[in-house]
Interface confidence: low
């Protein structure tokens, strides 16, 4: 018994000595190591070409940024069980092994940004990082987000994905990130926001999607974002935005929509109405079409400014018409076509405005119908839309008067949206993506087509109410 006890104390002494040695372990040559207030190994901007060997196992913080490290091998930091902060940004990382961060169960901050050659990250790379609250992947040249890349990161609060080359947001990419508050996606090449892109982000406070190529937002894209306070969509390719998408944003305070090719005709009515009721702070929403309203702020227009349907033969060359076919250069949603089946949303020239003819388009005198133009052309085809200057204008300082900006009415039947099967995937269908607040969800065929309030077969009562409030289209 006594011998066992002596052996135990010898073992204890050895363990204590080993621990002490770990803290006082030799520091890698290009690094500074210190113990107070946290055990830190600091090697920034030292010209290192590989993760240094001999990093003290007791390290709680490791700074390796600003070097020339090109590869993070599997289990590079496995011995550092207490690691909470790891910075590898501003290197030349081209490859990170899937098991590079194995064993780092206590890791809270991981910065991999400014590694433009990275381009892709194995979906298993971050598995097991259950305490991670900040992840920097900005400026990594990322072209896609692999399935399950962020799986299990339940503690994540800040996710930086800006300034990459992302073209799409796969369904359920962020599903497990129920505690995420900040999501930075600006400066990518994202062209649409599908229905399930932001599922699960119940705590999101700030969503930055500016300087992308977004032309289409699914009406249900923001369904889980009830706590969102800041939404930036400026400098994209939006010509319309379904108000149904904005309806779930009960906490929204700051909205930026400038630098988009907004079409301010009758299809913009729902968005206009939503903006009139919005009590938060919003940017200007400058119109691109029709020409007579170009540069004017949608928010400052009167309801009766939003008349008719603008058609363009090319960027910023509108033609107004009372008659349109699928063959027109930028095409028109059916709500602007007098021969469409949905007669409730079309004003045929010469017909009196009546309850059955509410929200209809008029033909301004002197405007002739277009000829067959040069084929579909995108409005604002530059890579990131119209880029703002280095100093973005501040948001209009409107203090919220109520805790919830009111949404647009969402009652009404489900209707097929205003793009036929024939044309629904073409860019010109996007001109008809007006807000669908009054038209319900719309059982669209694929995410490319969106319903519009003015394109829906509105119940007689709602048509009368809208006619009274908004006047004729």
């Amino acid at each position: 018994m006594k011998r066992a006890s002596a052996g135990g104390s010898r073992l204890l002494a050895w363990v204590l000595w080993l621990q002490a040695w770990q803290v006082a372990a030799p520091c890698p040559g290009a690094c500074v190591c210190y113990n107070e207030p946290k055990v830190t190994t600091s090697c920034p901007q030292q010209g290192l070409q590989a993760v240094p060997v001999g990093i003290p196992a007791a390290s709680q913080r490791i700074f390796l940024h600003g070097n020339r490290i090109s590869h993070v091998p599997a289990a590079s930091f496995r011995a550092c069980r207490n690691l909470t902060i790891l910075w590898l940004h501003s290197n030349v990382l081209a490859r990170i092994d899937a098991a590079a961060f194995t064993g780092l169960a206590l890791l809270e901050q991981l910065d991999l940004s400014d590694n433009a050659q990275l381009r892709s990250v194995d979906p298993a790379t971050f598995h097991g990082l259950g305490r991670l609250h900040t992840l920097h992947l900005d400026r990594c040249g990322l072209q896609e987000l692999g399935p399950g890349l962020f799986r299990g990161l339940a503690a994540l609060q800040y996710l930086y994905l800006q300034d990459n080359a992302l073209q799409a947001l796969p369904d359920d990419t962020f599903r497990d990130l129920g505690n995420l508050t900040h999501l930075f996606l600006h400066g990518n090449r994202i062209s649409s926001v599908p229905e399930r892109a932001f599922r699960g982000l119940h705590s999101l406070d700030r969503l930055l999607l500016h300087q992308n190529r977004v032309a289409h937002v699914h009406p249900h894209a923001f369904r889980d974002l009830g706590r969102l306070m800041t939404l930036y969509l400026f400098a994209n390719n939006l010509s319309a935005l379904p108000t149904e998408a904005l309806a779930p944003l009960r906490a929204l305070q700051y909205l930026r929509l400038n630098d988009n090719p907004w079409v301010c005709d009758c299809r913009a009515r729902p968005l206009w109405a939503w903006l009139q009721k919005f009590r938060g702070s919003s940017s200007e929403v400058p119109c691109s079409l029709p020409q007579r309203l170009a540069g004017r702020d949608l928010k400052r227009l009167a309801a009766n400014d939003l008349q008719g349907c603008a058609v363009a033969t090319g960027p910023y060359h509108p033609i107004w018409t009372g008659r349109a076919t699928d063959e027109e250069p930028l095409g028109l949603p059916k709500c602007c076509q007098p021969d469409a089946a949905d007669k409730a949303s079309v004003l045929e020239p010469g017909r009196p405005a009546s309850a059955g003819n509410a929200l209809k388009g008029r033909v301004p005198p002197g405007d002739s119908p277009p000829g067959n133009g040069s084929g579909p052309r995108h409005i604002n085809d530059s890579p990131f839309g119209t880029l703002p200057g280095s100093a973005e204008p501040p948001l209009t300082a409107v203090r919220p008067e109520g805790s919830e900006p009111p949404g647009f009415p969402t009652s009404g039947p489900r209707r097929r949206p205003g793009c036929s099967r024939k044309n629904r995937t073409r860019s010109h269908c996007r001109l008809g993506q007006a807000g669908s607040g009054g038209g319900g969800t719309g059982d669209s065929e694929g995410s490319g087509a969106l319903p519009s309030l003015t394109c829906s077969l509105t119940p007689l009562g709602l048509a009368l109410v809208l006619w009274t409030v908004l006047g004729p289209c």
């Epitope: 600091s42 920034p44 600003g66 100093a391």
Partner: antibody, heavy 127, light 109 residues
């Protein structure tokens, strides 16, 4: 609100060293850089160097390389500036200033602004 | 000094005064500009950061702008308490450090 408090005035002989401290009260240095800026009598401001305490590795203006040592003690929220081989032209008010450190991906010594500033320490070098 | 400012400027109360700051592509041309106000006998104080942003507490009479390799500070509705030295500053990529202008002494007549 964070305040930076510097040590009192010093009179030094040419060839000697001076060490000035700068303590943050009402906050820590954790997410900030601390820079040192000096101002000779009747002259403008001159940046000397800076440090982010959690990194422990300083950055010096070329003019002061080899003569300047900037350190920081994160546990006491104190930064230090030591200038050696003093000459009469080093007579100046030495200010410490806090610089927002804007987060992970930014380099340790990124362009940002100084706010707040310490009250300044007058160092007089005279024989 | 890497950044060039006029040594002095003056104006009468209520007037608008502009102070210029000229640099190069490695400082102002590629980084943001900050402005500091130094009242007589006191430490400098941040006046404008990131070209045109005002910290809380700075009156909106002060505004900043940047174009190319130059920046300017405008003070409208000049007041006697604005009499001070004003410094511009920017990060310099080639020097890997902060550079200041020589300062402009503003006199309110």
């Amino acid at each position: 609100e964070v305040q930076l408090v510097e040590t009192g005035a010093e009179v030094k002989k040419p060839g000697s060293s001076v060490k000035v401290s700068c303590k943050a009260s009402g906050g820590t240095f954790s997410n900030y850089a601390v820079s040192w800026v000096r101002q000779a009598p009747g002259q403008g401001l001159e940046w000397m160097g800076g440090i982010i305490p959690i990194f422990g590795i300083p950055n010096y203006a070329q003019k002061f390389q080899g003569r300047l040592t900037i350190t920081a003690d994160e546990s006491t929220s104190t930064a230090y500036m030591e200038l050696s081989s003093l000459r009469s032209e080093d007579t100046a008010i030495y200010y410490c200033a806090r610089k927002p450190y804007l987060g992970g991906r930014y380099s340790a010594f990124t362009p940002s602004w100084f706010d707040p500033w310490g009250q300044g320490t007058l160092v007089t070098v005279s024989s | 000094y890497e950044l060039t400012q006029p040594p002095s400027a003056s104006g009468t109360p209520g007037q608008r005064v502009t102070i210029s700051c000229s640099g190069s592509s490695s400082n102002i041309g590629s980084n943001t500009v900050n402005w500091y106000q130094q009242l007589p006998g006191t430490a400098p104080k941040l006046l404008i950061y990131s070209n045109n942003q005002r910290p809380s507490g700075v009156p909106d009479r002060f505004s900043g702008s940047k174009s190319g390799t130059s920046a300017s500070l405008a003070i409208s509705g000049l007041q006697s308490e604005d009499e001070a030295d004003y410094y511009c500053a920017a990060w310099d990529d080639s020097l890997n450090g902060v550079v200041f202008g020589g300062g402009t002494k503003l006199t309110v007549l």
